[in-house]
Amino acid sequence: AVSEHQLLHDKGKSIQDLRRRFFLHHLIAEIHTA
């Protein structure tokens, strides 16, 4: 079974990279960041 710690770790692993990719897209497309 996947531990709660591992799930939190996996979530944390991707969230800044998701924000990063979203912001790069925002700079190009000028979509609202909220």
């Epitope: 991707s14 800044q16 924000r19 790069l24 925002h26 190009i28 960041t33």
Partner: antibody
Framework: QVQLVESGGGVVQPGRSLRLSCAAS????????MSWVRQAPGKGLEWVAT????????YYPDSVKGRFTISRDNSKNTLYLQMNSLRAEDTAVYYC???????????WGQGTLVTVSS | QLVLTQSPSASASLGASVKLTCTLS???????IEWYQQQPEKGPRYVMD???????STGDGIPDRFSGSSSGAERYLTISSLQSEDEADYIC?????????????FGGGTKLTVLG
């Protein structure tokens, strides 16, 4: 190929203003966010400002917020940095940089030197 | 806050390999970073972005002698078959968006000397 050429640097007295320009070529300028990054003599890099493709969104660190203004003229393929109330600590080489879909500062110019001194 | 730490200097022999380290502040250990190269008297050049899992994408014209890897809060740039033109400052950087504000910080850089 992507080319970014900065200009407008020089010697300026504290408290005065200066406007830098960055002429872009080799790509569709209006399609990308652009930034300014500076480097004080013998020091590290410092992000200064970022602007979205159409100019609707701008971002600054606290160190320059309220004094510096980034803007762009997409019809002239030119990026600007208006610097007001200049201080000695603003002395640096100023680089413009272009983003890609993958990263913030993918392409850089050769820089223009700004010296703030009385 | 978001901080990147780099050793000020490193050296390795021509043809050898070198591994440069960039360490993220502990609470930001999962972050994707970027590596830049700055040769003497030149503007910076984008080398790669490097994710927490070690995957990376390199910039235009960067030879495949440059590779990246990660372990915990550490991000590594490995240069193999060192050449004289690899002598440069290597700087890591990281960005984030917090409450609709963008923040980007650079490490202090590592000056790489290639011994001939």
């Amino acid at each position: 190929q992507v080319q970014l050429v900065e200009s407008g640097g020089g010697v300026v007295q504290p408290g005065r203003s200066l406007r830098l320009s960055c002429a872009a070529s080799g790509f569709t300028f209006s399609s990308y966010g652009m930034s300014w990054v500076r480097q004080a003599p013998g020091k590290g890099l410092e992000w200064v400002a970022t602007i979205s493709s159409g100019g609707s969104y701008t971002y600054y660190p606290d160190s320059v917020k309220g004094r510096f203004t980034i803007s762009r003229d997409n019809s002239k393929n030119t990026l600007y940095l208006q610097m007001n109330s200049l201080r000695a600590e603003d002395t640096a080489v100023y680089y413009c940089a272009r983003q890609t879909t993958m990263t913030y500062f993918a392409y850089w110019g050769q820089g223009t030197l700004v010296t703030v001194s009385s | 806050q978001l901080v990147l730490t780099q050793s000020p200097s490193a050296s390795a022999s021509l043809g050898a390999s070198v591994k440069l380290t960039c360490t993220l502040s502990s609470q930001h250990s999962t972050y994707t970073i970027e590596w830049y190269q700055q040769q003497p008297e030149k503007g910076p050049r984008y080398v790669m972005d490097l994710k927490q899992d070690g995957s990376h994408s390199t910039g235009d014209g960067i030879p495949d002698r440059f590779s990246g890897s990660s372990s915990g809060a550490e991000r590594y740039l490995t240069i193999s078959s060192l050449q004289s033109e690899d002598e440069a400052d290597y700087i890591c950087g990281v960005g984030d968006t917090i409450k609709e504000q963008f923040v980007y910080v650079f490490g202090g850089g590592t000056k790489l000397t290639v011994l001939g």
